[in-house]
């Protein structure tokens, strides 16, 4: 798979492959994988990809199921790149405060917060 | 501050305190704090709170600015709790795939993805 494929297209394709290979993936009925309790997905990327690793090691490879796991590893690579961009740029306090305000505003409006 | 205050109310109050104390917070003109380049905020919580720690250590404490940092530490506590919930529950593959599908769906529609 060329890594030049836009991430958005990669995600769409991966969703389709996930549906296609569902039956094969659920073949192992005894397997247990951590599943986050909440829907703040970005907080859980590490655990999600650990789960994908567990699933891959238990799945018979071959054909387009390999493409599914290859795609998932490219998505992980993209997310790791985004995580790197969290701390690379040291800026003035002014900018940090504007970002913090944005972060809290997003928490206030978009996060799924339990009371 | 009672930790029983709902997180959503805590976030709102913190936003207000942030505006109130802006002038005091930007007093240190030489201070540099990492600011994420993108807007996928949840990926960057660790760096954001490290930045808050840096800012707190450089800010003259007293009055309601202390309340601001106390609030921020309670928000961090809430997020840490959410992160713990990422990996606590081990579920069947079916449930994991449902969550993975939801995660990719959210990535597809809500994440800020650079082309």
């Amino acid at each position: 798979i060329p890594t030049e494929i836009p991430t958005s297209a990669l995600v769409k394709e991966t969703l389709a492959l996930l549906s296609t290979h569902r039956t094969l993936l659920i073949a192992n009925e005894t397997l247990r994988i951590p599943v986050p309790v909440h829907k703040n997905h970005q907080l859980c990327t590490e655990e999600i990809f650990q789960g994908i690793g567990t699933l891959e090691s238990q799945t018979v490879q071959g054909g387009t199921v390999e493409r599914l796991f290859k795609n998932l590893s490219l998505i992980k690579k993209y997310i790791d790149g985004q995580k790197k961009k969290c701390g690379e740029e040291r800026r003035a306090v002014n900018q940090f405060l504007d970002y913090l305000q944005e972060f809290l505003g997003v928490m206030n409006t978009e996060w799924i917060i339990e009371s | 501050i009672p930790t029983e205050i709902p997180t959503s109310a805590l976030v709102k109050e913190t936003l207000a305190l942030l505006s109130t104390h802006r002038t005091l917070l930007i007093a240190n003109e030489t201070l540099r704090i990492p600011v994420p380049v993108h807007k996928n905020h949840q990926l960057c919580t660790e760096e954001i709170f490290q930045g808050i720690g840096t800012l707190e250590s450089q800010t003259v404490q007293g009055g309601t600015v202390e309340r601001l940092f106390k609030n921020l530490s309670l928000i961090k506590k809430y997020i840490d709790g959410q992160k713990k919930k990422c990996g606590e529950e081990r579920r069947a593959v079916n449930q994991f795939l449902d969550y993975l599908q939801e995660f990719l769906g959210v990535m597809n529609t809500e994440w800020i993805i650079e082309s």
Epitope: R91, A92, N94, Q95, D98, E102 | R32, K39, I112
Partner: antibody, heavy 119, light 107 residues
Framework: QVQLVQSGAEVKKPGASVKVSCKAS????????INWVRQAPGQGLEWIGY????????RYNQKFKGRATLTVDKSTSTAYMELSSLRSEDTAVYYC????????????WGQGTLVTVSS | DIQMTQSPSSLSASVGDRVTITCKAS??????LSWIQQKPGKAPKTLIH???RLIDGVPSRFSGSGSGQDFTLTISSLQPEDFATYYC?????????FGQGTKVEIK
């Protein structure tokens, strides 16, 4: 492709207000801040302020605070810069420019809008 | 506010010449500086960001260097299309400020 298209030239009388628009296309509008910069005839560039379409938060150069108002309409992916109490020295070309990332360089510029203030 | 002092304010050069423009910040701006080109009657165009990072599509004859307070834009071999005014911009802190510009003219 990514584009910022600005509204046409305006002629205003001193004391009046002007509202310049900047329509974004080719990218997700809320992902990038929009900055406003002006250039008086034969002069250099001057930063007016920025608006974050993600949360409607705006920040101004102190010189323009109280006179400039930055807004966005997310439904049409359009940013606006309104300048009130116009005086002759506000005659300038006004540009909108997109931040590449949070508080980063301006990677895309609008074509500019000439605002002439004359009695 | 951070002052950006650019020099020279204008220069005359010939095609093929190596041209250097400098920009000095009144305080440390790390490397948060970009170089902008503007041709008469046209919108500005950013050439370099973060002091030395060339933007995609910009010819490699343009290069930037410096950090802290002193920065340089170099055009290694001036081309006819490079005759324009060049500005530095600090985006380290608010308000963002520009240098006063350097006009590059044909000798």
């Amino acid at each position: 492709q990514v584009q910022l298209v600005q509204s046409g030239a305006e002629v205003k009388k001193p004391g009046a207000s002007v509202k310049v628009s900047c329509k974004a296309s080719g990218y997700t509008f809320t992902n990038h801040h929009i900055n406003w910069v002006r250039q008086a005839p034969g002069q250099g560039l001057e930063w007016i302020g920025y608006i974050n379409p993600y949360n409607d938060y705006s920040r101004y150069n102190q010189k323009f605070k109280g006179r400039a108002t930055l807004t966005v309409d997310k439904s049409t992916s359009t940013a606006y810069m309104e300048l009130s109490s116009l005086r002759s020295e506000d005659t300038a070309v006004y540009y909108c420019a997109r931040d590449y990332g949070n508080f980063w360089y301006f990677d895309v510029w609008g074509q500019g809008t000439l605002v002439t203030v004359s009695s | 506010d951070i002052q950006m002092t650019q020099s020279p304010s204008s220069l005359s050069a010939s095609v093929g010449d190596r041209v250097t423009i400098t920009c000095k910040a009144s305080q440390d701006i790390n490397s948060y500086l970009s170089w902008i080109q503007q041709k008469p009657g046209k919108a500005p165009k950013t050439l370099i960001h973060r002091a030395d990072r060339l933007i995609d599509g910009v010819p490699s004859r343009f290069s930037g260097s410096g950090s802290g307070q002193d920065f340089t834009l170099t055009i290694s071999s001036l081309q006819p299309e490079d005759f324009a005014t060049y500005y530095c911009l600090q985006y380290d802190d608010f308000p963002y400020t520009f240098g006063q510009g350097t006009k590059v003219e044909i000798k």
